[in-house]
Amino acid sequence: PSGLVTANITDSEALARWQPAIATVDSYVISYTGEKVPEITRTVSGNTVEYALTDLEPATEYTLRIFAEKGPQKSSTITAKFTTDLDSPRDLTATEVQSETALLTWRPPRASVTGYLLVYESVDGTVKEVIVGPDTTSYSLADLSPSTHYTAKIQALNGPLRSNMIQTIFTTIGLLYPFPKDCSQAMLNGDTTSGLYTIYLNGDKAEALEVFCDMTSDGGGWIVFLRRKNGRENFYQNWKAYAAGFGDRREEFWLGLDNLNKITAQGQYELRVDLRDHGETAFAVYDKFSVGDAKTRYKLKVEGYSGTAGDSMAYHNGRSFSTFDKDTDSAITNCALSYKGAFWYRNCHRVNLMGRYGDNNHSQGVNWFHWKGHEHSIQFAEMKLRPSNFRNLEGRRKRA
């Protein structure tokens, strides 16, 4: 035979190929050996022109020999040399992960090495490289960023030889959102109990706002911006009060139109309304909700109803906010004055959740027309908002 070559070399395999002998032969005898590796001999059919070498040692120079046999006759031997690849380290793992540190551990390759190349990269593209000694099987990473996804890779080195890289992915602990802009981000940070939280409008730490987060209704992550429950708070307030907000966030309150404008300007939000009365419950969800700025007189956008309470908010869509001292509704009379409340009145209301608590006179009370009509004041009502894509964010967090 002639033209002996090797191909497809890995750390444990290679493929030997040759040109067949001109004469017809019975068989070929292949043998291969390396330093500290006993010789292996195999006989293959005379029709064969390649042979897969397996169970090789990594990073080892092999000498490969082949000759042909026909009966008692043997051809001359041809020889080729090849070196197997350096095998990779194994089981790279990140442990003891903290906000700024992590410990990488691995098992060494079978081949002897002169060192390891460690590469770790954060999602923002920051890459760091470090070379460690041949006897090292762990390395402490420091100066990491909190709440950051990292990819760590390791490669074995032996002189000019380099193994394939293996990798592991980890996330440093700490807040996913150091300055959560709403209750959904607070929830994604791991806070799952309803109560008072500080959010930061537009994620700006200078724009802190204390809010009540509902972390249980339909998956949670809701900023509650209105609560009626006992009639202790006066909701017949003026324009200035409704712009700024009033009440106790743990009890009855209104978060404020300026805050609603700033929150809904952060992205696409959905509205949820929860109603409760003598053991009965109902809800309404609108998948698009926003409140304009003061120049628009806090114009309401509310679209895409689903729920059990009935679509009473559609009537108010596109309306500006009205109070007894700033009449922006489309009625000749002042709706806020007539119904002793404030709302995005038209002429006048199907929803009057800021009406007089417990007042069952027509249209005067806490009303949601398509649930309890205008002659029944609802005992408990909450209005709340969260990002429309919260379900996607929540799924991503669970996968992570």
Epitope: E303, A314, Y315, N317, S330, A331, R346, N347, C348, S363
Partner: antibody, heavy 120, light 107 residues
Framework: QVQLVESGGGLVQPGRSLRLSCAAS????????MHWVRQAPGKGLEWVSG????????YYADSVKGRFTISRDNAKNSLYLQMNSLRAEDTALYYC?????????????WGQGTMVTVSS | DIQMTQSPASLPTPVGDRVTITCRAS??????LNWYQQKPGKAPKLLIY???NLETGVPSRFSGSGSGTDFTLTISSLQPEDFATYYC?????????FGQGTKVDIK
């Protein structure tokens, strides 16, 4: 421009069925509730049925409940009224109308109507 | 169902006169009241919604007022093109109901 065009009216015997259609153009059809209103010859207006923008909620006058079915195909910008078990008192000009904003609201756009005559 | 009662049923009026049509609801409906004009052989046309809001393109001689149960449509100076039948309609609750109509004709 905004337009509603009804079709499907005609002469039908009592007890038979008819399906009215209304083709809408010039506005975002699925944003608005739609209604059918009828007017018997020489008489006033009578609301018949309504349907929300998504089609998820439907409403009927007592006089047609159980006999008429309102539906819509938002992909085709079309409103329908399936009328079964027709009676002589259903004879009227049937108008399709667009709701101004919410499901129960003013009707700001009307079609020209399609005549349904129920007679043996 | 809410009954809507219009008066008068017929109103012969000279051109240029002021016209007042009233509509009464059988129960309190806030301002959920609309007015329509219908000419013979034509579809109704929305004039006033929410008791007092003039629909786009409707002349300013038309106006609406009222709240609760009693409502009024006023034409400040009747023009020849205003001779028609006028209907009130409540959109407060389903079924939405119309008044029986008021025919304004030439005196």
């Amino acid at each position: 421009q905004v337009q509603l065009v009804e079709s499907g009216g005609g002469l039908v015997q009592p007890g038979r069925s008819l399906r009215l259609s209304c083709a809408a153009s010039g506005f975002t059809f699925d944003d608005y509730a739609m209604h059918w209103v009828r007017q018997a010859p020489g008489k006033g207006l009578e609301w018949v049925s309504g349907i929300s923008g998504s089609g998820g909620s439907t409403y009927y006058a007592d006089s047609v409940k159980g006999r008429f079915t309102i539906s819509r195909d938002n992909a085709k910008n079309s409103l329908y009224l399936q009328m079964n078990s027709l009676r002589a008192e259903d004879t009227a000009l049937y108008y399709c109308a667009k709701s101004y904003q919410s499901d129960e609201d003013a009707f700001d756009i009307w079609g020209q109507g399609t005549m349904v005559t129920v007679s043996s | 169902d809410i009954q809507m009662t219009q008066s008068p049923a017929s109103l012969p009026t000279p051109v240029g006169d002021r016209v007042t049509i009233t509509c009464r609801a059988s129960q309190y409906i806030q301002g959920f009241l609309n007015w329509y004009q219908q000419k013979p052989g034509k579809a109704p046309k929305l004039l006033i919604y929410d008791a007092s809001n003039l629909e786009t393109g409707v002349p300013s001689r038309f106006s609406g007022s009222g709240s609760g149960t009693d409502f009024t449509l006023t034409i400040s100076s009747l023009q020849p093109e205003d001779f028609a039948t006028y209907y009130c309609q409540q959109s407060y609750s389903t079924p939405q109901t119309f008044g029986q109509g008021t025919k304004v004709d030439i005196k």
